[in-house]
Each structure stands twice: as structure tokens, then as C-alpha cells.
């Protein structure tokens, strides 16, 4: 598994470096998770041909994965720091059930899948400290999540491979959009 942010050799070699700001820590954390997703996607793409699937095939999948929209305030048109931050946190909380689903989906990258899941939990904590309007953040219902997880795990092999691919791709895109917006804040 990769070394968590703040513990790589470069940091050890530079003891007099200024401590990271909250924004820098969040930035580094997201890039760390993106690295993890890259490694997981590599295994997925090597194992199946899902990565070459057409967008039509992906669109047919009825997963309700979080996605950025104009109304969320994270794009330049209609950019709104607080609305956007709420969307990012809410989206990450919604992704957690899908990251749990990924836990048994990898052979050689099992630790990496766990690292992505745990790092996302840490990222949520960082972002919650940054948010002023925590009341606006809706936490997913555990019962609904549990039944969704059961449903996903009951799919046939092809659908499970497709689901894994879709989750990784969507999570990557969500994090990229989130980080781009966070870099404006």
C-alpha cells in the first residue's frame, strides 16, 4: 500500500519545512486518493475489458453515483464556496458505500482498496472542519446502504466487473472536480 500523505521520504528529508495548511493537506490527500484509484483501475483494466466499454454500455447501468452538476456551485459558472463544499462532503459520504463494495473486488491490490477507503474517511473529516454549514450535509441512511451493498454483491460477475469499473471512474471524476473547485476556495 502507498505511504499516507505526510509520511513520504521527501517529508522525512525536510524536517524544517513549514507545516501544511488545511488547504494543502486536503489537496495532498485528494492526490493521494487519486493515485490509489489509478492503481485500482490498472488492475481492473488488466483483468477485464470494461475500460474499453462504450459510454452507452456504461450509461445503461443504473448506479446512482454522485456527480457534479451546475447547481452544486462547484463549476466556474455559479461558483459558490459553501454550496460546493456541502456537495463535495455529501458526495463523498454517498461514495462510502461504493468504496465498501470495492473492498472484496481486488486480488493484488487489496491493501490499495483499503487505503482508498480509509483515506476518503480522513478526507471527509478534513473537509467537515472546513465547512461552516454542517447542518446542510445529509448523511446516507445506513439501512438503505446495507440493502444497496447486498444488491450489488448479488450481481453476476460481468455486472460486478462493470460496477467496479464505474465506481472507480466516477469516484475519480468526482474527486477531480472537487479538487478543482477546492483550489478556487
Amino acid at each position: 500500500a502507498p505511504v499516507p500523505p505526510g509520511e513520504d521520504s521527501k517529508d522525512v528529508a525536510a524536517p524544517h519545512r513549514q507545516p501544511l495548511t488545511s488547504s494543502e493537506r486536503i489537496d495532498k490527500q485528494i492526490r493521494y486518493i487519486l493515485d490509489g484509484i489509478s492503481a485500482l483501475r490498472k488492475e481492473t483494466c488488466n483483468k477485464s475489458n470494461m475500460c474499453e466499454s462504450s459510454k452507452e454500455a456504461l450509461a445503461e447501468n443504473n448506479l446512482n453515483l454522485p456527480k457534479m452538476a451546475e447547481k452544486d456551485g462547484c463549476f466556474q459558472s455559479g461558483f459558490n464556496e459553501e454550496t460546493c463544499l456541502v456537495k463535495i462532503i455529501t458526495g463523498l459520504l454517498e461514495f462510502e458505500v461504493y468504496l465498501e463494495y470495492l473492498q472484496n473486488r481486488f486480488e493484488s491490490s487489496e491493501e490499495q482498496a483499503r487505503a482508498v477507503q480509509m483515506s476518503t474517511k480522513v478526507l471527509i473529516q478534513f473537509l467537515q472542519k472546513k465547512a461552516k454549514n454542517l447542518d446542510a450535509i445529509t448523511t446516507p441512511d445506513p439501512t438503505t446502504n446495507a440493502s444497496l451493498l447486498t444488491k450489488l454483491q448479488a450481481q453476476n460477475q460481468w455486472l460486478q466487473d462493470m460496477t467496479t469499473h464505474l465506481i472507480l471512474r466516477s469516484f475519480k471524476e468526482f474527486l477531480q472536480s472537487s479538487l478543482r473547485a477546492l483550489r478556487q476556495m
Epitope: L34, Q76, K172, Q176, S177, L179, R180, R183, Q184
Partner: nanobody, 124 residues
Framework: QVQLQESGGGLVQAGGSLRLSCTVS????????MGWFRQAPGKEREFVAD????????WYADSVKGRFTISRDNAKNTMYLQMNSLKPEDTAVYYC?????????????????WGQGTQVTVSS
């Protein structure tokens, strides 16, 4: 290491247009976020615009909004900057850059590879 090559710069009168291109070598072009920056003599390099991998997240500096348009063609490994209603203050060397994380942003440190730059001069 990714290679970037800008082209399309030149001398143009105020009010005129130019279209800059940035061609990238490397098969993972379509996963990169890309940005345009510019640097006038004696000034710091400043953000102009950036674009994500599938062109659905574009950002512009306030100074160019409504006049410049960033776009990309993943099949051609090329990014563009259409510059209209040019002003003398747009005079600078224009650089393209890539962010391999696919994020982009308004600071040079967010990007890991840069082109050599192309000169744009707007005369009054």
C-alpha cells in the same frame, strides 16, 4: 516525460484574433487536465484558462472571460486557445501546461509539464 509544443502566436492589432494550439506527445493525453498561462516581461506567470479531460469543466481568469475560449481535441492530442477582441495588455508569452492528476487550477505549481511558450504581441 510529456512534450508540449505551442504554436499560433504572432503580432496582431488590438481588436483582432489569434488561435493558439498546444500539441502534446503521449498516449494518456485524454486523461490530463490542461491549462494556458501567460507571462509579460517583468511580471509573474499568470493563469489564463484551464480545461479538464472531457471538456466539461472550464475555468477562465476574469481578465479574459468572454473573450478567450479554451478547448481540446483528444483525438489530435491538442488543446486550443481562441483569443478574440485582443487588447495590448494581452501581450505576453503564452505557455501551455498539463496536470497528470487531471485537475488543473490557477497556480503554476499545479502543473507538472510545460511547453516552451509562444509570443503574442497586440499592438494598439
Amino acid at each position: 516525460q510529456v512534450q508540449l509544443q505551442e504554436s499560433g502566436g504572432g503580432l496582431v492589432q488590438a481588436g483582432g484574433s489569434l488561435r493558439l494550439s498546444c500539441t502534446v506527445s503521449g498516449r494518456t493525453f485524454s486523461t490530463y487536465a490542461m491549462g494556458w498561462f501567460r507571462q509579460a516581461p517583468g511580471k509573474e506567470r499568470e493563469f489564463v484558462a484551464d480545461i479538464n479531460w472531457n471538456s466539461d469543466n472550464l475555468w477562465y481568469a476574469d481578465s479574459v472571460k468572454g473573450r478567450f475560449t479554451i478547448s481540446r481535441d483528444n483525438a489530435k492530442n491538442t488543446m486550443y486557445l481562441q483569443m478574440n477582441s485582443l487588447k495590448p495588455e494581452d501581450t505576453a508569452v503564452y505557455y501551455c501546461a498539463v496536470d497528470s492528476y487531471g485537475v488543473g487550477g490557477g497556480k503554476p505549481e499545479y502543473y507538472d509539464s510545460w511547453g516552451q511558450g509562444t509570443q503574442v504581441t497586440v499592438s494598439s
